[in-house]
């Protein structure tokens, strides 16, 4: 099918466009493009005709257009009007005739655009500032950039007119930045030169420094303040409400402990007009303190909080120590120093963590000690634990189960029997116990602190006859000379033993037979093919006793070294060769030869018609077993000779 | 002056055959298309058939396809339609006519004065 | 094939009047039509191609419109020598004409 395809699509004015024809039919008359979507011969462009390679210019002929031998079209210096369909018209040699309309789209080269904006000096949170990209340009698109990244997403920015205008509403002094505006078109994007927003704010709350407000005797006392400010605040010092000097740092050398007070920094916005100030009570001690701990959270809760613990007070100049049950601190990546060690943070506390901690100074004589601080780190519960374990009882007996499971502060706990609340204990007592005592018994362990909860369900079945035994194992496929497998006889009973049969005998005495939890779990180690047997368990009591189902043990073994048959080794020529390999193995192996090295095939049998001494050599055969990941394999030598040289040869399948 | 000329028509029995030759002059007959129109006796215009210029491209109208053949001869400036079984239905006015050289839709610029064909027993 | 329909067949007019012919196809024909006019024992005289370009030596009283199925002559001052049959004819392939429509004078 005839079709034109604009190259570009989207064009630049002055520039030039190519109409390019595909799928031109290759026996032409001639052809002819038009502008608008239709043949008309008032708005034709130009026309060629194949016979007398003419080219003939039509009423829409501008002297900007080239046509080519392949139909194609291309228009120079591109102007606006030249914007929309063109229709090529074809006449085949048979004067069919075929057109196809493509078209283009026109658009102008963009200027360099500018930000104008309506508030050069805005005051954070009072004022907006509307930044506007100039010039307003046709068909174009508008994108802003700050720090030339795109527009976050913010209720107090703004697009409006087009995207040409980007408000910021209530400016903070994190609108501080670099604006830039683009403009694009399908052909061009122009970028803005930056724009720098100069906010004015603050002054914040001025910040002290140093933090510590505990000095010695005899040392020099050098405080700073700051501020946050646009333009720089101006900074003024007050000590116990006296004004002191009007400069950012406060400097008294060899203080005493009349030099003890309030000291007040006032920081001022000439523009802005704001004051703000900051007190921070200085203490001269003549000695050094006793240190004492505080801690950030006096209840943290296991693997959700972490513990900030602060020896106080904060003194210049001084070395922080710590200690944990007695100990230096361990190595873990869950305590961390902070950089002057006066503050020791634990990260997802656990159980584990609750001390006892104790911090100290160091001064030039001696290390002062502080009290000791135990943390009480919130757990729990975890998992119940229902005691005892058994599950079977006869009618007549006590039940008494307790519940049990790790929490801080401790579980409070609840029984329920088949869904149904029965009460809020650690131990249920019930005696003298029927068959309709059987079922779900349920404790449930709650902290109230932490607000979780855990359950654990035991089925009881109280019966004068035991149940039917069965055996669970901890491995199904055990492998030969590699694996253990522990049977254990479920359920487990009150006051009832255990039996074990092998092949229908009881137990053979083997170091690698081991019996335990109370003769309920039998134990094999390094397991072996002959252990590939039927076990039964059986459990008795007072009253009754019964067997399990015999569970048979699938041992996986080989495999073996392989036998080639028959064992002969020479054969006459014009003979069958018909080899077979076996090897003891489970799973059954997979079998494959080798002649002379040579891969053959995967068959337990090789069968080669009529040999001849061609056939000499040697014969492997390889055997694996993919269950138990092993090999092995044989290796055969075959001699043909011819026939009648030598007797005695055999003579083949 | 552009001028065609055509000749070859007259009476005929019906499946006879005939050969109508048109003689051009004034333009470049070689690089032209070709045509040949019918008239009926007072009924409208039936084109018949085209001819590319170097004879390669022929086309003919449903009702003569297989009976009549257009040719032409560039070095004599003649075109030929040569009518075989000829039936009643083609006595007409036959007109011999020239597409013009130019890229447009095509249609016939110039026209002889035709010649009668009858077909009758 | 596509077939072509004019109306009227047949249509009386004074000099100076204005006659409009129209043309019908019976499938898309794009801008692919023509028109010629006829006068009794002469050869047909081509009057418009590609539906409306005018033929060079034909008066502009003559002009074309319409593309696709529907298209029109029209004679915007009707002179003497134009009561003649004019035929519209399909471009493309084959070469069909109109049954015709003649001019007579009223």
């Known amino acids: 099918k005839l079709t034109i395809e604009s190259t570009p699509f989207n064009v630049a004015e002055g520039k030039e466009v190519l109409l390019l024809v595909h799928n031109l039919p290759q026996h032409l008359f001639g052809y002819s493009w038009y502008k608008g979507e239709r043949v008309d011969g008032n708005r034709q462009i130009i026309g060629y005709v194949i016979g007398t390679q003419q080219a003939t210019p039509g009423p829409a002929y501008s002297g900007r257009e080239i046509i080519y031998p392949n139909a194609s079209l291309l228009i120079q210096n591109i102007i606006q009007n030249d914007t929309g369909f063109y229709t090529l018209h074809v006449i085949k040699s048979d004067l069919v005739n075929e057109e196809a309309t493509g078209q283009f789209r026109v658009y102008p080269e963009l200027p360099k655009p500018s930000i104008s904006s309506n508030n050069s000096k805005p005051v954070e949170d009072k004022d907006a500032v509307a930044f506007t990209c100039e010039p307003e340009t046709q068909d174009a698109t508008y994108l802003w950039w700050v720090n030339n990244q795109s527009l976050p997403v913010s209720p107090r920015l703004q697009l409006s007119n087009g995207n040409r205008t980007l408000t910021l509403f209530n400016v903070t002094r994190n609108d501080t930045a670099s604006y830039k505006c683009e403009t694009q078109n399908p052909v061009s994007a122009r970028r803005s030169d930056s724009v720098i927003l100069n906010v004015l704010y603050g002054p914040d709350a001025p910040t002290i420094s140093p933090l510590n407000t505990s000095y010695r005797s005899g040392e020099n006392l050098n405080l700073s303040c700051h501020a946050a400010s646009n333009p720089p605040a101006q900074y003024s010092w007050f000590v116990n409400g006296t004004f002191q000097q009007s400069t950012q740092e406060l400097f008294i050398p060899n203080i005493t402990v009349n030099n003890s007070g309030s000291y007040t920094c006032q920081a001022h916005n000439s523009d802005t007009g704001l004051n703000r100030t900051t007190v921070t009570t200085i203490t001269v001690y003549a000695e050094p303190p006793k240190p004492f701990i505080t801690s950030n959270n006096s209840n943290p809760v296991e693997d959700e909080d972490a513990v900030a613990l602060t020896c106080e007070p904060e003194i210049q100049n001084t070395t922080y120590l710590w200690w944990v049950n007695n100990q230096s601190l361990p190595v873990s990546p869950r305590l961390q120093l902070s950089n002057d060690n006066r503050t020791l943070t634990l990260l997802s506390v656990t159980r584990n963590d609750v001390g006892p901690y104790e911090c100290g100074i160091q001064n030039e004589l001696s290390v002062d000690h502080s009290d000791p601080v135990i943390l009480n780190v919130l757990y729990g519960p975890d998992d119940p634990t229902i005691s005892p374990s058994y599950t079977y009882y006869r009618p007549g007996v006590n039940l008494s189960l307790s519940c049990h499971a790790a929490s801080n502060p401790p579980a409070q706990y609840s029984w329920l029997i088949d869904g149904n609340i029965q009460q809020h204990t650690q131990e249920l007592f019930i005696s003298n116990i029927t068959e309709k005592n059987s079922g779900l018994y349920t404790c449930q362990a709650n902290n109230s602190a932490s607000g979780h909860s855990r359950t654990t369900v035991k089925t009881i079945t109280v019966s004068a006859e035991l149940p039917k035994p069965s055996i669970s194992s901890n491995n199904s496929k055990p492998v030969e000379d590699k694996d253990a497998v522990a049977f254990t006889c479920e359920p487990e009973a009150q006051n009832t033993t255990y039996l074990w049969w092998v092949n229908g005998q009881s137990l053979p005495v083997s170091p690698r037979l081991q019996l335990s939890n109370g003769n309920r779990t039998l134990t094999l180690f390094n397991v072996t093919r002959n252990d590939a047997r039927a076990y039964v368990c059986g459990i008795q009591n007072s009253v009754s006793a019964n067997r399990s189902d015999p569970v048979t043990l699938d041992v996986l073994y080989g495999p073996d070294t392989p036998i080639i048959s028959p064992p002969d080794s020479s054969y006459l020529s014009g003979a069958n060769l018909n080899l077979s390999c076996h090897s003891a193995s489970n799973p059954s192996p997979q079998y494959s030869w080798r002649i002379n090295g040579i891969p053959q095939q995967h068959t337990q049998v090789l069968f080669i018609a009529k040999i001849t001494p061609n056939n000499n050599g040697t014969y492997a055969c390889f055997v694996s077993n993919l269950a138990t990941g092993r090999n092995n394999s044989i290796v055969k030598s075959i001699t043909v000779s011819a026939s009648g040289t030598s007797p005695g040869l055999s003579a083949g399948a | 002056e552009v001028q065609l000329l055509e000749s070859g028509g007259g009476l005929v029995q019906p499946g006879g055959s005939l050969r109508l030759s048109c003689a051009a002059s004034g333009f470049t007959f070689s690089s032209s298309y070709m045509g040949w129109v019918r008239q009926a006796p007072g009924k409208g215009l039936e084109w018949v058939s085209s001819?590319?210029?170097?004879?390669?491209?022929?086309s003919y109208a449903d009702s003569v396809k297989g009976r009549f053949t257009i040719s032409r001869d560039n070095s004599k400036n003649t075109l030929y339609l040569q009518m075989n079984s000829l039936r009643a239905e083609d006595t007409a006015v036959y007109y011999c006519?020239?597409?013009?050289?130019?890229?447009?839709?095509?249609?016939?610029?110039?026209w002889g004065q035709g010649t009668l064909v009858t077909v009758s027993s | 094939d596509i077939q072509m329909t004019q109306s009227p067949s047949s249509l009386s007019a004074s000099v100076g009047d204005r006659v409009t012919i129209t043309c019908r196809a019976s499938?898309?024909?794009?801008?692919?039509l023509n028109w010629y006019q006829q006068k009794p024992g002469k050869a047909p005289k081509l009057l418009i191609y590609a539906a409306s370009s005018l033929q060079s030596g034909v008066p502009s009283r003559f002009s074309g419109s319409g593309s696709g199925t529907d298209f029109t002559l029209t004679i915007s001052s009707l002179q003497p020598e134009d009561f003649a049959t004019y035929y519209c004819?399909?471009?493309?392939?084959?070469?069909?004409f109109g049954q015709g429509t003649k001019l007579e004078i009223k």
């Open positions: 004819q399909q471009a493309g392939n084959p070469h069909t």
């Open positions: 001819i590319g210029s170097g004879s390669y491209s022929t």
């Open positions: 499938q898309s024909i794009s801008s692919y």
């Open positions: 006519a020239r597409y013009p050289s130019v890229p447009f839709p095509p249609h016939f610029d110039y």
